[in-house]
């Protein structure tokens, strides 16, 4: 039960998060103007990864996107990549573990596989959460240095007669929407590994042990988390699941986890 | 058609105030911002501050802060402006001017409202 | 504040003649964010309020004859009036739409022959 709600919480969670890393990917205030100890301005600049955009005193905004690619700044693009990165990894791993999830039924799927496909999917949101928290932290670096280095022109760059308005621009909300999501997408990440270990039976290093009773056959496994009634298919001892108790022959021919400790 | 109404004029004692409206019609009062600009005569204009009715947000010129005090009444759509503490210095001709959507420029004007500071 | 500085503070014309007037600013008025230049040009004939000519510097405001055309980036702006008319006697103002305290200039005073 308790595995079943990590799981379904870490994929929720995940979920919130994805889509905060898509919203913030597609907003548009990465960047706003900054209006703090700034002369005041009739108009608000703000940018985001795929436009700026400008809005008047009376409420009129005006949006231009970026139609160059070579023209634009690589670490720019470079975030623009791991935002990417990260919303591609985080919908596959979405896809995946729908199919992972422990109250979804798909077919005669084993636990083994699902436990498999939890693991997988948790691993692509952590990555997916960390490209989001490293795209927005780029991006974030990059408007700290800006920032700094147009606070000194203005300044420093008062010699001449003309005055130039400095537009300087801090953190926009896309910011912390991509934090926010790339922490969720990577928490639930983790959820959903932490989910896996329960799934995934523990190996044992007990050997099976079988009782052929007169009637039908008992297998009577200690470690195990299941014993197989001689009724129908498992009658020869057949491991029940992966990573569960094995017949005393297959414990023989597979070395445990156990062994190497 | 936007349309701005202001009285003709107003003839003020020193030391007294007076509140000029400018009336708008035909367009959404609210959505825009309702300007002030002061006029002497040998002189240029000086804009001295605008309202932007949906909010009451205001932006006055830190020239007449203290002097001048705008309102709107969006029931009636008119805006106002107060003046105080008058001298001869703001006998003037007053304009309200309601600025465009799509940029930060006055699009239309009012016929200004002259007014006379004299004992 | 941003001063605007007029120049020539009047001039005196024959219709049919090519006139430029000149605006410039303390401070550049170009936003970054949009490549715009906040500058307005307003006439204002005699007895009457100012009217909107030009706005962003170089974009005219519909009704207004084509004859009117605004130029200039940055600190320096102009206004030329192709071929002036009988009906242009008037004082023409630049105006600072980009840094509060909005201001303006002190007018050019157009006079025909």
């Known amino acids: 039960m308790a595995v079943t709600a990590c799981q379904g919480l870490g994929f929720v969670v995940s979920l919130i998060g994805i889509a905060g890393i898509i919203a913030a990917t597609c907003m548009d205030q990465w960047s706003t103007q900054d209006l703090y100890n700034n002369p005041v301005t009739a108009v608000f600049n703000y940018q985001g990864l795929w436009r700026s955009c400008v809005r008047e005193s009376s409420g009129f905004t005006e949006c231009r996107g970026y139609f160059t690619l070579l023209g634009l700044p690589a670490m720019l693009q470079a975030v623009r990549a791991l935002m990417i990165v990260g919303i591609v990894l985080g919908a596959i791993g979405l896809l995946v573990s729908i199919f992972a999830l422990k109250c979804i039924r798909i077919g005669s799927m084993e636990d083994s596989a699902k436990a498999n496909m939890t693991l997988t999917s948790g691993i692509m949101f952590i990555v997916s959460g960390l490209c989001a928290i490293a795209g927005v932290s780029v991006f974030a670096n990059m408007l700290v240095t800006n920032f700094w280095m147009s606070t000194a022109n203005m300044y420093t760059g008062m010699g001449g007669m003309v005055q130039t308005v400095q537009t300087r621009y801090t953190f926009g909300a896309a910011l912390f929407v991509g934090w926010v999501a790339g922490g969720l997408t990577l928490i639930g990440g983790v959820m959903m590994c932490i989910a896996c270990r329960g799934l995934a039976p523990e190996e044992t290093n007990y050997k099976a042990v079988s009782y052929h009773a007169s009637g039908h056959s008992v297998a009577y496994k200690p470690g195990g988390f299941k014993a197989s009634t001689g009724f129908g298919s498992n009658t020869k001892n057949k491991k029940i699941y992966d990573g569960g108790a094995r017949t005393e022959d297959e414990v023989q021919s597979y070395p445990s986890k156990h062994d190497y400790v | 058609q936007v349309q701005l109404q202001q009285p003709g004029a107003e003839l003020v004692k020193p030391g007294a105030s007076v509140k000029v409206s400018c009336k708008a019609s035909g367009s959404t009062f609210t959505t825009y911002w309702m300007h002030w600009v002061k006029k002497r005569p040998g002189q240029g204009l000086e804009w001295i501050g605008g309202i932007r009715p949906f909010d009451s947000n205001t932006n006055y010129n830190h020239k007449f802060k203290g002097k001048a005090t705008l309102t709107v009444d969006k029931a009636s759509n008119t805006a106002y402006m107060q003046l105080s503490s008058l001298t001869s210095e703001d006998s003037a001709v007053y304009y309200c001017?309601?600025?465009?959507?799509?940029?930060?420029?006055?699009?239309?004007w009012g016929q200004g409202t002259v007014v006379t500071v004299s004992a | 504040d941003i001063v605007m500085t007029q120049s020539p503070s009047s001039l005196t014309v024959t219709p049919g003649e090519k006139v430029t007037m000149n605006c410039k600013s303390s401070?550049?008025?170009?936003?970054?964010?949009?490549?715009?230049?906040?500058v307005t040009w307003y006439q204002q004939k005699p007895g009457q309020p100012p009217k909107l000519l030009m706005f962003w510097a170089s974009t005219r405001e519909s009704g207004v004859p084509d004859r009117f055309t605004g130029s200039g980036s940055g600190t320096d702006f102009t206004l030329i009036i192709s071929s002036v008319q009988a009906e242009d006697l008037a004082v023409y103002h630049c105006?600072?739409?980009?840094?509060?305290?909005?201001?303006f200039g002190s007018g050019t005073k157009l006079e025909i022959k």
């Open positions: 001017a309601m600025g465009a959507y799509y940029s930060n420029s006055f699009a239309y």
């Open positions: 401070q550049s008025l170009l936003n970054s964010g949009n490549q715009k230049n906040y």
């Open positions: 105006q600072n739409d980009y840094v509060y305290p909005f201001t």
